[in-house]
Interface confidence: medium
């Protein structure tokens, strides 16, 4: 009885097809597989970026695999052949492991790339980010940024760019057409007269750095002598109803601070007879149900129902900004 | 609109130390990011440090381990500590503030080095 043995897939490669972190990892299917014709190999791809305490581990009869990493860092991985019990008499077997590691050669000192980077989703609809000049650069120094995500073709680089000092220090993204739910990718790297600039890579989904705009159209009902409902409407734009979380404050004469999170458009709050002025103010955030995380809107206009008697239906409506 | 003006600059000995301090119109609580830039003769101006709101700095290679940046939110100040001062130090240094997507740099103070 010989033992059985299978190599290693070859020519294990990852390849870095210009997406900004988006690499490929292939291989070919291992020498001497003749036999094993009647069987169908498998494969097990173990990957990470360095420095991660885990690999993702994939188990696969393909040839190729592809998956985001940060390019900030170095990336390795391995992968073995696998032959399932029914090709080897009943005990799968493992090939060695095939290895390769993947990094971009940085150019220039750590301090040089950008900091405190900002990404921001405009109520679902604009997209800007922004970010401070890197240490011990010159004001020569410029910034680039380019981006990509699935169903783009090749990277983009930023047309629009906000700049401070004659640098660039931000973009403004165009339309970006069914670009949520899946990995964004950008770069930022930088040119200067005198001393290269290191690349700064990240990543995120843009669902959730969205600021939606603020709640509109507050009003007031009077629904019993002791309850009054607040409603308001939700801003102009893409997002539906569905998404919204939202947070209210509301002050009795000017001394009770009352905050609630609802999520409906609609707040019932149990009044005194005594009260003599409501005002409330509300803001929106995207909530976990279109959304992993937010960022939340500014306030709402604040809203306020004045009178005598807040159980006789006067109502004064003062729009002016909450601070 | 952010006003900016540095002092403590002067003449000093290879080897000596200066404090500079760079004092601002309005309040600086809200404003995430400052820094010291400087430009030597007939050279660009370049960041040397920062320091956001949480207190966390960055030093440009050249001045790591020599200066040290601070700031006092209650007193409206950034500040920039220069030990061990070189004659390559010798620059018009300014002062740095970034709320937002502007940008604010005052009108700058003399450091000479120089036995």
């Known amino acids: 009885d010989t033992e059985i043995k299978v190599n290693p897939p070859q020519d294990f490669e990852i390849v870095d097809p210009g997406y900004l972190g988006y690499l490929y990892l292939q291989w070919q299917p291992p020498l001497s597989l003749d036999h094993f014709k009647e069987c169908t190999v498998e494969y097990e791809l173990k990957y990470r970026n360095i420095g991660s305490e885990t690999w993702k581990t994939i188990i696969t009869k393909n040839l190729h695999y592809k998956d985001g990493f940060d390019l900030n860092k170095g990336i390795e991985a391995k992968i073995h052949t696998l032959l399932p019990w029914q090709c080897t008499n009943g005990s799968e077997v493992q090939s060695s492991w095939a290895e390769t590691t993947y990094w971009i050669s940085p150019q220039g000192i750590p301090e040089t790339k950008v900091q405190d980077m900002d990404c921001v989703y405009y109520n679902w609809q604009y997209l800007l980010c922004s970010w401070k000049p890197g240490i011990g650069v010159l004001l020569d120094t410029n910034y680039n940024l380019f981006y990509w995500y699935e169903g783009l073709d090749h990277a983009l680089q930023c047309v629009d760019y906000i700049k401070a000092d004659g640098q660039n220090i931000g973009c403004r993204f165009p339309y970006l057409e069914a670009s949520d739910y899946k990995d964004f990718y950008i770069c930022v790297n930088g040119s200067s007269e005198n001393k290269p600039i290191r690349s700064s890579y990240f990543t995120f989904q843009l669902q959730n750095i969205v600021k939606p705009l603020p709640p509109v159209y507050l009003t007031f009902t009077r629904e019993s002598s002791c309850e009054i409902k607040l409603k308001w409407s939700i801003p102009l734009g893409p997002i539906p109803a569905r998404c919204f979380d939202y947070e209210i404050e509301i002050r009795e004469d000017d001394t009770t601070l009352v905050t609630a999170t609802v999520e409906n458009e609609t707040y019932t709050l149990k009044t005194t007879n005594e009260t003599r002025q409501l005002c409330f103010v509300v803001r929106s955030k995207v909530n976990i149900y279109c959304s992993d995380d937010g960022i939340w809107s500014e306030w709402s206009d604040k809203q306020c129902w004045e009178g005598e008697d807040l159980s006789k239906k006067t109502l004064l409506r003062h729009h002016h900004h909450h601070h | 609109q952010v006003q900016l003006q540095e002092s403590g600059g002067g003449l000093v000995q290879p080897g000596g130390s200066l404090r500079l301090s760079c004092t601002a119109s309005?309040?600086?609580?809200?404003?995430?990011?400052m820094a010291w830039g400087r430009q030597g003769p007939g050279k660009p101006r370049e960041l040397i440090a920062t320091?956001?709101?949480?207190?966390?700095?960055n030093y440009a290679e050249s001045v790591k381990g020599r200066f040290t940046v601070s700031r006092d939110n209650a007193e409206n100040t950034l500040y920039l500590q220069m030990n061990n001062l070189k004659s390559e130090d010798t620059a018009v240094y300014y002062c740095?503030?970034?709320?937002?997507?502007?940008?604010?740099w005052g009108q700058g103070t003399q450091v000479t080095v120089s036995s």
């Open positions: 740095n503030a970034r709320p937002g997507l502007q940008s604010y």
């Open positions: 320091i956001n709101s949480a207190g966390d700095t």
């Open positions: 309005g309040s600086i609580r809200g404003i995430g990011y």
